[in-house]
Interface confidence: low
């Protein structure tokens, strides 16, 4: 359904909301609902000399049989319900008298409902409605062993492991306005550390003293350790309980879910199920080895008469998980949208490497010291997300397969700059199977951790520009973080991009960074890459951007926990065949991040190969004319000269595999 429109008469006053219904929007974001009306009997004009407009506009929200009037507008004046004073506005009225578009700021869960745009003109009346569903939930997440053990990178990964992403300040603010409170400092997506407090008390004053609100410690060094606030958006599948008279150990619970065609649910999935109304007064195992239960109907014997996802702890200070051999129900998840967690993940490195969520009980609040110590002990496991490499290491060294001579006919394209104005250089290169005039590659000069001849040296890893799909500038801030994580990297910081720039990195593509700014490094300024620095070299910035805007992303990879190897055969591989070939060799298709990390270790191949995201790339350490130009870097093959478009999955190429 698109919209509901009603009108008393044909060919009379008509109102429309040209927007599909229901409209699903993220917690904490803003919403614009377009509403236009046509009044044939009283044509409107925008000339300043006309008399005031007579039509009356009314916006209301209908939920659970109750209508709340948000605002009323007539004769160019807008009266807003005082409860929504800072919340709703008509951005285009009265400048465009027939445009009743509504803007709603900082969406909260309770902003869900049916929005009605009603226009009255004399005795005529017409309206249109749109259902709005605010989706998502913010939850606090804590390391299993003790409080404040997550640095910024691990905080992001912890959320991702729990079917969530790190929350934005806007999402935490919206959750706070919805009633969320937590006296625990946690990372947010903009690299700030905050916590929401409704009832200020000793130990929880933060920077706001006795006033309610979200406390902030500002932008923190990424090595400092705190908890994290995660945001779970939605799930396609279903959370359900599995039980038996004798209950399950953790391993038995995992096996039981698998027997039922499912897997243990993550904390984020349980939160979404709770938000949808799940209520179970029985604790169950989750994928991160935590034990929790969702309470939607408060009762004294189920979580202390409080609502929420309750957590079972071993210690009175709300740390430590139950022993894996203790017995609880199993909370399972079935659906396609799960994030894989390796079978042995939680057995590696001891308890300090496991992250969990905490619920703060009212009679046992942990005080938050005003001076937080930096650098608490941290675990060393690097969390990764799909694809996860659950392979047993092969005792055999991977053989270097034979390669082919360059195919005659590969076309080199002169330097171009695409329509959007900021482009890198595509190069023809010798890779069989692309055919003449189809290979467009981009030069991603990157900076690496290990010394490659003739290349600048950046301690600590590789910064690279990433465009995961076929089109340019397609990633929101949240999607950008996930894209880097999916490729075995993390979103880069401004400092990392600056260091890469200083070491010679240039890329004329705007990309997200972890502080929610959008930047790109330019060593040799040219017309479409001027940005905010005119003719001076430097990292260009668009500053902090709304998280819903779309750009590319700059990722950072600091180590390779395994080995990337080049694979080929006479007929080469389609994308599916490449996946299967790598798997048949106890490996997986490498991610872009893994290829960058391998390139930084010296991997040099003048043949493009499939990667896990369906892209086609090749690493060049020693530049030569036939291999992607005059600079080292990882080259990307595009379909189109403006450097967009992924290769056809049925086309045949080599492959890069990864063995962990």
């Amino acid at each position: 359904a698109v919209t509901v429109e009603t009108s008393d008469h044909d060919n009379s006053l008509s109102v429309s909301i040209p927007q599909p219904s229901p409209l699903r929007v993220l917690l904490g974001t803003s919403l614009t609902i377009p509403c236009y009306f046509i009044d044939p009997m009283h044509p409107v004009t925008t000339a300043p000399s006309t008399a005031p407009l007579a039509p009356r506009i009314k916006w209301s929200r209908v939920s659970k049989e109750k209508e709340v009037v948000l605002l009323v507008a007539t004769e160019g004046r807008v009266r807003v319900n005082s409860a929504y004073q800072d919340k709703v506005s008509l951005p285009n009225y009265p400048a465009i008298p027939s445009d009743a578009t509504l803007e709603v700021q900082s969406l909260r869960s309770n902003d869900s409902g049916v929005y009605r745009c009603e226009v009255m003109h004399g005795i005529e009346d017409s309206e249109a409605t749109l259902e709005v569903v605010v989706k998502g939930i913010v939850f606090h997440y804590r390391a299993i062993s003790t409080r404040y053990t997550l640095d910024f990178d691990r905080a992001q990964r912890a959320c991702l492991q729990n079917s969530a992403i790190i929350a934005t300040p806007e999402q935490l603010q919206a959750a706070y306005e919805d009633g969320f409170h937590q006296c625990d400092a946690g990372w947010l997506a903009d690299q700030t550390v905050r916590y929401p407090i409704h009832t200020p008390r000793e130990g929880c004053y933060g920077d706001k003293d006795e006033f309610p609100g979200v406390r902030t410690y500002g932008i923190r060094d990424t090595n400092e350790t705190y908890d994290v606030y995660c945001f779970a958006e939605e799930m396609e599948g279903e959370v359900f309980y599995a039980t038996s008279p004798e209950k399950f150990t953790f391993q038995e619970a995992a096996n039981e879910c698998r027997r039922l065609g499912a897997r243990l649910a993550t904390t984020g999935q349980l939160y979404l199920a709770w938000q949808a109304g799940m209520d179970m007064c029985s604790a169950g195992w989750l994928a991160d080895r935590s034990v929790r239960y969702p309470i939607s109907k408060a009762r004294p014997n189920c979580g202390g008469n409080l609502l929420g996802v309750r957590t079972v702890y071993v210690h009175a200070n709300q740390t430590g998980y139950p022993d894996p051999s203790s017995r609880y129900d199993a909370i399972c998840y079935t659906g396609e949208d799960f994030v894989d967690i390796p079978e042995n993940f939680f057995g590696v490195g001891g308890e300090e490497d496991i992250t969990v969520q905490t619920v703060t009980w009212p009679d046992m609040e942990l005080p938050l010291p005003r001076n937080i110590t930096e650098g608490e002990a941290r675990g060393s496991v690097i969390l990764t997300v799909k694809p996860i490499f659950e392979v047993s290491p092969s005792p055999l060294e991977p053989e270097e397969p034979f390669t082919f001579a360059p195919e005659i006919g590969a076309t080199a394209f002169a330097e171009v700059e695409n329509e959007t104005g900021e482009a890198t250089r595509p190069w023809g290169f010798p890779t069989p199977g692309l055919g003449p005039a189809t290979a467009f590659t981009s030069e991603d000069l990157v900076v690496q951790v290990t010394a490659v001849p003739g290349q600048p040296h950046l301690p600590g890893g590789v910064v690279f520009h990433y465009r995961p799909g076929p089109t340019r500038y397609s990633l929101t801030f949240e999607e950008a973080q996930q894209a880097c994580l999916r490729t075995g990297a993390v979103i880069a910081s401004p400092e990392q991009l600056q260091a890469a720039y200083e070491a010679g990195y240039e890329q004329c593509d705007a990309g997200w960074l972890r502080d929610q700014t959008v930047r790109y490094p330019i060593v040799s300024p040219r017309t479409p890459c001027v940005g905010d620095k005119d003719s001076s070299p430097g990292v260009r910035t668009y500053g902090v951007r709304p998280s819903t805007e779309t750009y590319d992303v700059y990722c950072f990879v600091d180590r390779l926990e395994g080995e990337v190897f080049f694979a080929t055969r006479l007929e080469q591989f389609t994308f599916q065949e490449a996946l299967e070939f790598c798997e048949s060799h106890n490996a997986t298709l490498a991610t872009t991040g893994q290829l960058y990390a391998a390139w930084s270790r010296g991997l040099d191949k003048c043949y493009a190969g499939w990667l896990a995201d369906g892209s086609l790339r090749y690493p060049i350490v020693t530049p030569r004319p036939a291999c992607g130009g005059d600079k080292p870097g990882v080259r990307t093959v595009y379909l189109y000269p403006n450097q967009t478009g992924l290769p056809d999955p049925l086309s045949r190429h080599h492959a890069f595999c990864f063995r962990g």
Epitope: Q85, D86, T541, Y542, G543, V544, R545
Partner: nanobody, 125 residues
Framework: QLQLVESGGGSGQPGGSLRLSCAAS????????VGWFRQAPGKEREGIAC????????TYVDTVKGRFTISRDNAKRTVDLSLDSLKPEDTAVYYC??????????????????WGRGTQVTVSL
Amino acid sequence: QLQLVESGGGSGQPGGSLRLSCAASGFDLDYYAVGWFRQAPGKEREGIACTSVSGANTTYVDTVKGRFTISRDNAKRTVDLSLDSLKPEDTAVYYCATTWGIHWCPLSASEYRRWGRGTQVTVSL
């Protein structure tokens, strides 16, 4: 209602001074870069001055450099533009506008999201 309101316009003499103020209603200015623009009759709207979120970075168009000064007071939700050494060619409708919280500030109108309704400045003998 979220809006910007300009005030302080009026008539001035060549060589004289005026002080324009831009007030935010319904939202905090401290997340936004703020720009001042002007539009003379029959001419395009031009960016003349802007201030970054922190106020640390300011930009001026060449024609007003050294004569106009932009300043901000986030606590009061205002951004002021002081117009000194006025010239007849400064006659225009002056608008303030905000763009998302960027740390440098542009003078291009297309970068700005929310606009005030303007205040008239007339410079004549």
